[in-house]
Amino acid sequence: SEGRKTWRRRGQQPPPPPRTEAAPAAGQPVESFPLDFTAVEGNMDSFMAQVKSLAQSLYPCSAQQLNEDLRLHLLLNTSVTCNDGSPAGYYLKESRGSRRWLLFLEGGWYCFNRENCDSRYDTMRRLMSSRDWPRTRTGTGILSSQPEENPYWWNANMVFIPYCSSDVWSGASSKSEKNEYAFMGALIIQEVVRELLGRGLSGAKVLLLAGSSAGGTGVLLNVDRVAEQLEKLGYPAIQVRGLADSGWFLDNKQYRHTDCVDTITCAPTEAIRRGIRYWNGVVPERCRRQFQEGEEWNCFFGYKVYPTLRCPVFVVQWLFDEAQLTVDNVHLTGQPVQEGLRLYIQNLGRELRHTLKDVPASFAPACLSHEIIIRSHWTDVQVKGTSLPRALHCWDRSLHDSHKASKTPLKGCPVHLVDSCPWPHCNPSCPTVRDQFTGQEMNVAQFLMHMGFDMQTVAQPQGLEPSELLGMLSNGS
């Protein structure tokens, strides 16, 4: 995703950020009301301009409060650490008028043995250590406080939790003589929640645990545990929900089988099987009980863990996810695609769609991409005419109006949005694809031909002539 080059160049280490004591709780914050966009769908730009102008005139206009940045806080409990023993932490931007809290789990693959963790430490250290983290981060996409960029939850308290445990947020083991690295992903989440309670989370109405890629899988693995933790600590009224972006993977057969040598080529089931032992990984209790000892790896796969979860979870997943294709050994490097591979890719989309059949709150565009919710343009993609922020708003409403048990969606406010067209980028609102050779933008028709799709085959099931289909796709319809 964009805007991620935030780490500091070597030799430019900032002084360590202050481990600030918890701020005294302010007066009970007033709930910010959810916005209902139904009446303004046709004129969103003008509406957003009005909202922003209203928000800014009501907001105390000190430069600090209008600052977009989230500020780093290293954990006060320094025994909860990144892989290398440096303290874990979180970035926070408070919104004192709101009782909504968004906790975002960063992604970034994983490592599952000494060799590939050593290599990761020497090339991607910010994913294993807090030593060089910058003091601030800019919130983008769903973490933005700008209503135009984040029409969904712009006014929420924003928390970005950097991924530095390399364990898909599942680990519960500390660094020791025996263990060169700590894997404390699950414990980091618990400790961040504990510390945030002293910073205003105690007055929250809704906690949305969100994440992308490995962070999205982390949501599925941790959302119920967070709810349980808050209940035990005496905050049963805080509604805990999950938003899992690009973390709903399939344990399908690889296109080409390769030995489990490194993170990328290792089949996901084998990588997780090895990882879970190396990390001392923990999975949701209700899911764990469904599988035999040693089979806990199953709970890392969305379609297996989801039915066991108690908290409401909204699943966002590209039907042709690039990380899924990578672990399946599909590498689209610009060469026209052979028929066998084309069928494999189409089948992947079909299988993924099938696993989302019984997920009432889901958004799955037929695009070839990876991650969406902290992209600045996360509002652009639509499924069946509905954008993701709009779908999330509808989900909020459905939960607010106690529709959780009911299968009937709110009128004009859909939450189950899964593309049904069968090939990559058949949805014209997909993110732009670039030709890997020239860097030029490709339209859908060019992309499909480039992928080796025969227009006759594609047009036939739609009851169209190839020329008609090409025209429609080129016009973005």
């Epitope: 160049r9 070597r10 693959w109 020497d122």
Partner: antibody
Framework: DVQLLESGGGLVQPGGSRKLSCAAS????????MHWVRQAPEKGLEWVAY????????YYADTVKGRLTLSRDNSKNTLFLEMTSLRSEDTAMYYC????????????WGQGTSLTVSS | DIVLTQSPASLAVSLGQRATISCRAS??????????IHWYQQKPGQPPKLLIY???DLESGVPARFSGSGSGAAFTLNIHPVEEEDAATYYC?????????FGSGTKLEIK
């Protein structure tokens, strides 16, 4: 000032052995993964081997696997490359390079040491 | 292993013009928002020198006429305007996974 200085090159007979060294200064050696890269006369760069910052993991290119042993002494800020069963195709300039830990790119190179394998 | 294909093998560019060098990977070298491709310049009798890291970031001290772009599996090094001192061989390199590899090199000659 960050510096890498290779030594140990020279003329060796085919089948012979040689140990190359790389002395580092001006930075915390134990913080960085270190690599050897070689360049045959009039040819391109070829990645040879990697030693993790702690020295616990080593990785070799297929072309040298089984004939090279990479080690490091973090207390002496030195990287070693022991080469056995040398062949004429191992004739090259051998560079030691430091890999940045925020991307794995080689931000510092030594001047190289020349190894010639010939009878 | 990831294979890097560099093109052209050599090129001659007039002073002040643009030089464009391409590097294609056999599979994506991008992950988590970063592209693990880097560019080096090497002059005869000297070790390589880092120009661009993570596809597009300029190494400090390197003139701004050097720029890098690309993502996924396709990357480009641009030099504009080309100067006399830019005559050298240029290499791309990936650090996405072990083993690391280099492209075969592009020799730039100034006309």
């Amino acid at each position: 000032d960050v510096q890498l200085l290779e030594s140990g090159g020279g003329l060796v007979q085919p089948g012979g052995s040689r140990k190359l060294s790389c002395a580092a200064s001006g930075f915390t050696f134990s913080d960085f993964g270190m690599h050897w890269v070689r360049q045959a006369p009039e040819k391109g760069l070829e990645w040879v081997a990697y030693s993790s910052s702690g020295g616990t993991t080593v990785y070799y290119a297929d072309t040298v696997k089984g004939r090279l042993t990479l080690s490091r002494d973090n207390s002496k800020n030195t990287l070693f490359l022991e080469m056995t069963s040398l062949r004429s195709e191992d004739t090259a300039m051998y560079y030691c390079a430091r890999a940045s830990y925020d991307g794995g790119y080689f931000d510092c190179w030594g001047q190289g040491t020349s190894l010639t394998v010939s009878s | 292993d990831i294979v890097l294909t560099q093109s052209p093998a050599s090129l001659a560019v007039s002073l002040g013009q643009r030089a464009t060098i391409s590097c294609r990977a056999s599979k994506s070298v991008s992950t988590s928002g970063y592209s693990y491709i880097h560019w080096y310049q090497q002059k005869p009798g000297q070790p390589p020198k880092l120009l661009i890291y993570l596809a597009s970031d300029l190494e400090s001290g390197v003139p701004a006429r050097f720029s890098g772009s690309g993502s996924g599996a396709a990357f480009t090094l641009n030099i504009h305007p080309v100067e006399e001192e830019d005559a050298a061989t240029y290499y791309c390199h990936h650090s996405r996974e072990l083993p690391f590899t280099f492209g075969s090199g592009t020799k730039l000659e100034i006309k």
